[in-house]
């Protein structure tokens, strides 16, 4: 088996909760400057299942701002520009990792958290339940 | 901006890179009480802009497996079940946070990384460029 050698360049943790509490470098690699999804594409307006983007802000979370999609209609926009209720606009959801300050208000202590966010909407054929 | 008051119960950080390097409790808290709602919809098949899910695997990243959506068609599925090329299937993208070991193999040192993933597809009206 492989034994991982103790890397002398590793930060040392004397924390009694180790290995659950670790050091995380927040100097994000791949920092895409464009965090507002409205700026990256206008699909939210051009979609047949258009959505509004709501700003979800929480100073106790990292990232503090997350954009949540809310479908504008129950149905989908047809070729005439009208809402067709034979189809459904539904949110596409994604589970993401965030950091939450724990204990609250601590500037350098966080807990890893999974949250579910709505990223956009898509138009689907409804599931028809036939009554027996 | 919001100034976070110093909580006397906070872990102290003497790290010279503070606040970029923080302590994180990796005992993941899942806010999604109904287990894994992210996994429970079949919208990828029922959408008018259906997509396939492709596995993006990286054993040195958490999560190790991320699913990437790829739209099945350039156009969208119409009421007859045919592909209508007057409309476009496009991917909805989202930036997500992942954890990477840094330096590699250090048991208690991580770095946050942002990656862009395609979560699903939506059907949009194409942008028509008129030639002057």
């Amino acid at each position: 088996g492989i034994t991982i050698p103790r890397n002398p360049g590793c930060p040392n943790s004397e924390d009694k909760n180790f290995p659950r509490t670790v050091m995380v470098n927040l100097n994000i690699h791949n920092r895409n400057t464009n965090t507002n999804p409205k700026r990256s594409s206008d699909y939210y307006n051009r979609s047949t299942s258009p959505w509004n983007l709501h700003r979800n802000e929480d100073p106790e979370r990292y990232p503090s701002v997350i954009w949540e999609a809310q479908c504008r209609h129950l149905g989908c926009i047809n070729a005439d520009g009208n809402v067709d209720y034979h189809m459904n606009s539904v949110p596409i959801q994604q589970e993401i990792l965030v950091l939450r300050r724990e204990p609250p208000h601590c500037p350098n202590s966080f807990r890893l958290e999974k949250i579910l966010v709505s990223v956009g909407c898509t138009c689907v054929t409804p599931i028809v339940h036939h009554v027996q | 901006g919001i100034t976070i008051p110093r909580n006397p119960g906070c872990p102290n950080s003497e790290d010279k890179n503070f606040p970029r390097t923080v302590m994180v409790n990796l005992n993941i808290h899942n806010r999604n009480t109904n287990t894994n709602p992210k996994r429970s919809s079949d919208y990828y098949n029922r959408s008018t802009s259906p997509w396939n899910l492709h596995r993006n695997e990286d054993p040195e990243r958490y999560p190790s497996v991320i699913w990437e959506a790829q739209c099945r068609h350039l156009g969208c599925i119409n009421a007859d079940g045919n592909v209508d090329y007057h409309m476009n299937s496009v991917p909805i993208q989202q930036e997500i946070l992942v954890l990477r070991r840094e330096p590699p193999h250090c048991p208690n040192s991580f770095r946050l990384e942002k990656i862009l993933v395609s979560v699903g597809c939506t059907c949009v009206t194409p942008i028509v460029h008129h030639v002057q």
Partner: antibody
Framework: QVQLVQSGAEVKKPGSSVKVSCKAS????????ISWVRQAPGQGLEWMGS????????NYAQKFQGRVTITADESTSTAYMELSSLRSEDTAVYYC??????????WGQGTLVTVSS | DIQMTQSPSSLSASVGDRVTITCRAS??????LNWYQQKPGKAPKLLIY???SLQSGVPSRFSGSGSGTDFTLTISSLQPEDFAVYYC????????FGQGTKVEIK
Amino acid sequence: QVQLVQSGAEVKKPGSSVKVSCKASGGTFSSYAISWVRQAPGQGLEWMGSIIPWFGYTNYAQKFQGRVTITADESTSTAYMELSSLRSEDTAVYYCARDSEYYFDHWGQGTLVTVSS
Amino acid sequence: DIQMTQSPSSLSASVGDRVTITCRASQGISNWLNWYQQKPGKAPKLLIYAASSLQSGVPSRFSGSGSGTDFTLTISSLQPEDFAVYYCQQYSDDPTFGQGTKVEIK
């Protein structure tokens, strides 16, 4: 190529505990979870719980909550499953498996635990 | 827990036959369904993940389909080494397995 090698067969008395090990060779644990799955003689497969060794994060099936403890030692790339208060119904082959949180793609060879007075 | 029901529980087939095993989930699980093969005295082996994706190294005669609650594993032309027990498993929630389908020689 990842290989999971488990400890040998055990015979235990009712009421006692058993601790089975699972060593990853040919690669570290990386960021995957390790799950434990058991199979009683002639029966199907039953998931018991998992651990993400990177984090020490555990998740247990409700049926085994309070009776199973899963741990991992990253320095030796070994995961452990301890089951306490053993009863005859716990006689089974216990497997460890690498878990992407979507599927189990590598399995140990299995460890037979026999509970008998 | 999500219940997984396989059918049939056993079947007899000959080499070269096309074999189909079905699996039904007690609630919608999208495409988060896997298929495993287990031979006597051996650990299970992953064949299909995410309902229809073939795990690397698995012969192309194995295929999976389905979405939501109903799924199928198909072996297009049964080979001598395919006689085994097959399990479906969901990972939409904490993992649960079907009871297994034994494929025997006719």
